[in-house]
């Protein structure tokens, strides 16, 4: 007998063929003798079964012998041997439907599981192999799991059902809630105006929660919360702030936050968290803030950095268009008796300039500016 | 949601052949049969044939046969329709639509082909 | 070919009026029709399927009967979207056939 394999929710259409390419009478039944369609004339009727209102046929093929059978909004217990009777012979074909879903929400957070249950008809034994967007395969029966769920999980998986040699294919789209970078840092000079930024990985219509922004200063000996605010359908609304620093942001996605001005004693590591609506745990974005100052007091010419910067990390005190007077990987250093001209204080790594800070010194009878 | 998208605006010269595409999205392309239909600026509707992409198998109307072919690509979920020896009251906008079992839905946005010299 | 054949070509209405337009078979085709609306510049949609039977989303004031070779679209009160050119379509056989149109315009 021939075997269809469907999709729970989709359409299927079991084939029945007439040897005479003309409209004859036909009956389809299931396995318990009861009728499911067929034909008066040119009229289709029904039978009793429970797939009268999702039963239907083409009836344009009946001309041409062919009397099929259209199953709509397929169900597990759709799965049965189905009989079409035409021309005193009987054709039977097996009928498996089978359902492929996630276990609770298609959206989840970043480090969360992924299982996939596969529902199917008794006495099947269908095997089940997946591909996530990023290539990775994975195998099973009647539960498929994938643990600690990464951003390149995002996207569509194909999974295929395989049972009695025929197979069926699945589309799942699945989106990993997360901040598209993990951990970002910042350079910037005493004085400067800092901006933070916290783009999101995925795009959902609405978007509700509540974040805080938790920093913990280079100088201090306790994170400290910066802010807190509330997200509403996309609409960013602060609901406290510290006085110092006040920080400002955006009413807009993505989040975006302002500080007035990078000082030493701000420099440090964030944490901001954002916690969405129905949904359990958090979603984390790290950030650094390195700040650098240069200053000339009496005889000495002084460059300092503030805030998580890498051992790898090369500081350099030098003249304008003359070789480094001095580079070390430290988060100071210094020029004694510097000769008059505009010095640069360089942050760099592995050659590339992160920060960079001018400071203009005079000769000794004045006192030095800062452009 | 079930979604049927047509390739643009084609501007062709008697003789000639055009392949229009048609690509599905949001159900299981193989499970429907895909028809195209045309209709002549200000002028009705016209059936021209079927493809079940499940099969293969295909339907002309007569009057379309031998200058019509419905293909499918299943990987890309895409059906065409190439007409050949194109002549100026080809001109037309040709849709394609999906069988929803003996009737037309739902419909693509349809493509204009211009057949002209 | 079955041909079909509708009533009027077109006609004038107002909003909230009854209108009624028919389809003639040159065959018999039981109850194998199908309503179309078109809007200009837009793709048909299916109204009526079966003869009788509203598709899913469409306004209950849009019905159809008949059966054999008479059918009727009957929209109860029409509304300004009705605004249209209605088509009816056989599927008893193939080719299938469209009939001509029928376009609703504002009175």
């Known amino acids: 007998k021939k075997v269809v394999l469907g999709k729970k929710g989709d359409t299927v259409e079991l084939t029945c063929t007439a040897s005479q390419k003309k409209s004859i009478q036909f009956h389809w039944k299931n396995s318990n003798q009861i009728k499911i369609l067929g034909n008066q004339g040119s009229f289709l009727t029904k039978g009793p079964s429970k797939l009268n209102d999702r039963a239907d046929s083409r009836r344009s093929l009946w001309d041409q012998g062919n009397f099929p059978l259209i199953i709509k909004n397929l169900k597990i217990e759709d799965s049965d041997t189905y009989i079409c009777e035409v021309e005193d012979q009987k054709e039977e074909v097996q009928l498996l439907v089978f359902g492929l879903t996630a276990n609770s929400d298609t959206h989840l957070l970043q480090g969360q599981s992924l299982t996939l249950t596969l529902e199917s008809p008794p006495g099947s034994s269908p095997s089940v192999q997946c591909r996530s967007p990023r290539g990775k395969n994975i195998q099973g029966g009647k539960t498929l799991s994938v643990s600690q769920l990464e951003l390149q999980d995002s996207g569509t998986w194909t999974c295929t059902v395989l049972q009695n040699q025929k197979k069926v294919e699945f589309k799942i789209d699945i989106v990993v809630l997360a901040f598209q970078k993990a951990s970002s840092i910042v350079y910037k000079k005493e004085g400067e105006q800092v901006e933070f930024s916290f783009p999101l990985a995925f795009t959902v219509e609405k978007l509700t929660g509540s974040g805080e922004l938790w920093w913990q200063a280079e100088r201090a000996s306790s994170s400290k919360s910066w802010i807190t605010f509330d997200l509403k359908n996309k609409e960013v609304s602060v609901k406290r702030v510290t006085q110092d620093p006040k920080l400002q942001m955006g009413k807009k996605l993505p989040l975006h936050l302002t500080l007035p001005q990078a000082l030493p004693q701000y420099a440090g590591s964030g944490n901001l968290t954002l916690a969405l609506e129905a949904k359990t745990g958090k979603l984390h974005q790290e950030v650094n803030l390195v700040v650098m100052r240069a200053t000339q007091l009496q005889k000495n010419l002084t460059c300092e950095v503030w805030g998580p910067t890498s051992p790898k990390l090369m500081l350099s005190l030098k003249l304008e268009n003359k070789e480094a007077k001095v580079s070390k990987r430290e988060k100071a250093v210094w020029v004694l008796n510097p000769e008059a001209g505009m010095w640069q204080c360089l942050l760099s790594d592995s050659g590339q300039v992160l920060l960079e800070s001018n400071i203009k010194v005079l000769p000794t009878w004045s006192t030095p500016v800062q452009p | 949601q079930v979604q049927l998208v047509q390739s643009g605006a084609e501007v062709k010269k008697p003789g000639s052949s055009v392949k229009v595409s048609c690509k599905a999205s949001?159900?299981?392309?193989?499970?429907?049969?895909i028809h195209w239909v045309r209709q002549a600026p200000g002028q009705g509707l016209e059936w021209m044939g079927w493809m079940n992409p499940n099969s293969g198998n295909t339907g002309y109307a007569q009057k379309f046969q031998g200058r019509v072919t419905i293909t499918a690509d299943e990987s890309t979920s895409t059906a065409y329709m190439e007409l050949s020896s194109l002549r100026s009251e080809d001109t037309a906008v040709y849709y394609c639509a999906r069988d929803w079992p003996n009737w037309f839905d739902p419909w693509g946005q349809g493509t204009l082909v211009t057949v002209s010299s | 070919d079955i041909q079909m054949t509708q009533s009027p070509s077109s006609l004038s209405a107002s909003v909230g009026d009854r209108v009624t337009i028919t389809c003639r078979a040159s065959?018999?085709?039981?109850?194998?029709l199908a309503w179309y609306q078109q809007k200009p510049g837009k793709a048909p949609k299916l109204l009526i399927y079966d003869a009788s039977s509203l598709q899913s989303g469409v306004p209950s004031r849009f019905s159809g009967s008949g059966s054999g070779t008479d059918f009727t679209l009957t929209i109860s009160s029409l509304q300004p979207e009705d605004f249209a050119t209605y088509y009816c379509q056989q599927a008893i056989s193939f080719p299938l056939t469209f009939g001509g149109g029928t376009k609703v315009e504002i009175k």
């Open positions: 949001g159900y299981t392309f193989t499970n429907y049969y």
């Open positions: 065959q018999d085709i039981s109850n194998w």
